[in-house]
């Protein structure tokens, strides 16, 4: 599809990277953005650069020199970006390709002005990776009196995420936003499906459970079985087969 | 963090050559010029010249013509600095600096201890 | 070749004088200027540069001011630590030159 070179191919992917995948707030000088993992990405400052500069340097972290212009040429040095950054020197843009986690830092845009002064700006890069699916794992499930007691745990391997409750798609109230959903349901308000949906701030992925009578297991969407699967449906299976 | 550590000092006979070496770390070596600088017992400073850790590009002050050499080795992030034909005003301590960028813009933000070069007979 | 000279050559001051130091340059030079501090058998620091612009690390009552031929530095509140002397250097053109430094001596 690109045949017009890595240049073109990555002005065409960041146009067409999605919102979502890019978050920007901007504080004072420094300017905050968070992307998702594997994505390419532009650093560039809101401003024109000064006129006619005398020298560009970019660099991560403070004293780590990514890539120079001094108005003959640009000069990349060793660093782990070596081969994923271009630098556009008209806007001073810098361009990354598939960034990583570790490339979380505070990205620096130095600028000598011909005159003899400096200008410089930050940009602190955050990198997320996209939130895993996450499973629901049933705690405990009790008929009490025609109320149901429902424990449910959403589960995703270590990460710092958000986590939203929906009972047949509508949202439990905030306070029982957290990874784990304890309630006790009375009759009229239950729900047949129970879904809980992880996300950050770059992507977000939800898991389904749903009950069949109300206060018993059922089948669930995009969602992995643990051992409380099997209490709930093998005797279930079992029974079916036996009659 | 930054830093630079010159060699040791030296005693020369007027006529011998001194190598001084300048080894750095906490940077991108390459990344930015080293400017060499004396200053004789009692006095100011002088600038003596600058190389180009990126490409080896040199400058010189125009006294010191033919008789300075500095270098670079990026494979040990050390520049050095050579001084022929001493002669006793020679005798100076001397200075390796980092300069901002790898096009020199003339301001050294980190110093090297110094290196103290006397020369007598 | 640029001269920079730097008047006084040297200032007796007290703790919390105000005290200017000024740098003239034969030629206009934008304000390609550094000023540094160099205290008795230590390296030069950098304190200004770009004639106003202070170095990181820096103390605020440090700052700088001028362009083209006539620079100044001015120490709002003199600390015992700033007891030391001052260089400029110009940056505007090979070969770098220095001024010929200013004395700043306890009174």
């Known amino acids: 599809m690109c045949s017009r070179g890595w240049d073109s191919c990555l002005a065409l992917e960041l146009l067409l990277l999605p919102l979502s995948l890019l978050v920007t707030s901007i504080q004072g000088h420094l300017v905050h953005m968070t992307v998702v993992s594997g994505s390419n990405v532009t650093l560039n400052i809101s401003e024109s650069l000064p006129e006619n500069y005398k020298q560009l340097t970019w660099f991560y972290t403070f004293d780590q020199k990514i890539v120079e212009w001094d108005s003959r040429k640009s000069k990349y040095f060793e660093s782990k970006f070596k081969g994923r950054v271009r630098l556009d020197p008209q806007s001073g843009a810098l361009y990354i390709s598939k960034v990583q986690k570790e490339d979380n830092s505070t990205y620096i845009m130095r600028v000598l002005k011909k005159t003899g002064n400096e200008q410089e700006w930050k940009i602190k890069l955050q990198v997320l990776d996209p939130v895993p699916k996450p499973v629901i794992k049933i705690e405990k499930i009790e008929d009490m009196d025609d109320n149901c007691y429902l424990k449910l745990s959403c589960v995703i391997p270590g990460e710092s995420v958000n986590y939203t409750w929906y009972g047949d798609k509508r949202p439990f109230p905030k306070e029982l936003q957290n990874s784990v959903l304890e309630t006790t349901l009375m009759p009229h308000n239950y729900s047949r499906c129970y879904t809980c949906q992880v996300s950050n701030s770059v992507s977000s992925k939800n898991g389904t459970v749903c009950l069949s009578p109300p206060c018993t297991l059922a089948r669930s969407f995009g969602v992995e079985w643990i051992a409380s699967w099997l209490v709930v449906t093998v005797p279930t299976i079992l029974g079916l087969l036996l009659t | 963090q930054v830093r630079l550590v010159e060699s040791g000092a030296e005693v020369k006979k007027p006529g011998a050559s001194v190598k001084v070496s300048c080894k750095t770390s906490g940077y991108t070596f390459a990344g930015y010029g080293i400017t060499w600088v004396r200053q004789a017992p009692g006095r100011g400073l002088e600038w003596m010249g600058w190389?180009?850790?990126?490409?080896?590009?040199?400058d010189y002050a125009q006294s010191l013509q033919g008789r300075v050499t500095m270098t670079t080795d990026t494979s040990t992030s050390t520049a050095y600095m050579e001084l022929r034909s001493l002669r006793s005003d020679d005798t100076a301590m001397y200075y390796c600096a980092r300069d901002r960028y790898s096009s020199s813009s003339g301001y050294f933000d980190y110093w090297g201890q110094g290196t103290l070069v006397t020369v007598s007979s | 070749a640029i001269q920079l000279t730097q008047s006084p050559s040297s200032v007796s001051a007290s703790v919390g004088d105000r005290v200017t130091i000024t740098c003239r340059a034969s030629?206009?030079?934008?304000?390609?200027l550094a000023w540094y501090q160099q205290k008795p058998g230590k390296a030069p620091k950098l304190l200004m540069f770009g004639a106003s612009s202070l170095q990181s690390g820096v103390p605020s009552r440090f700052s700088g001011s001028g362009s083209g031929t006539d620079f100044i530095l001015t120490i709002s509140s003199l600390q015992p630590e700033d007891f030391a002397t001052y260089y400029c250097q110009q940056a505007n053109s090979f070969p770098y030159s220095f001024g010929q430094g200013t004395k700043v001596e306890i009174k």
């Open positions: 030629q206009g030079i934008s304000s390609w």
């Open positions: 190389v180009s850790a990126y490409n080896g590009d040199t």
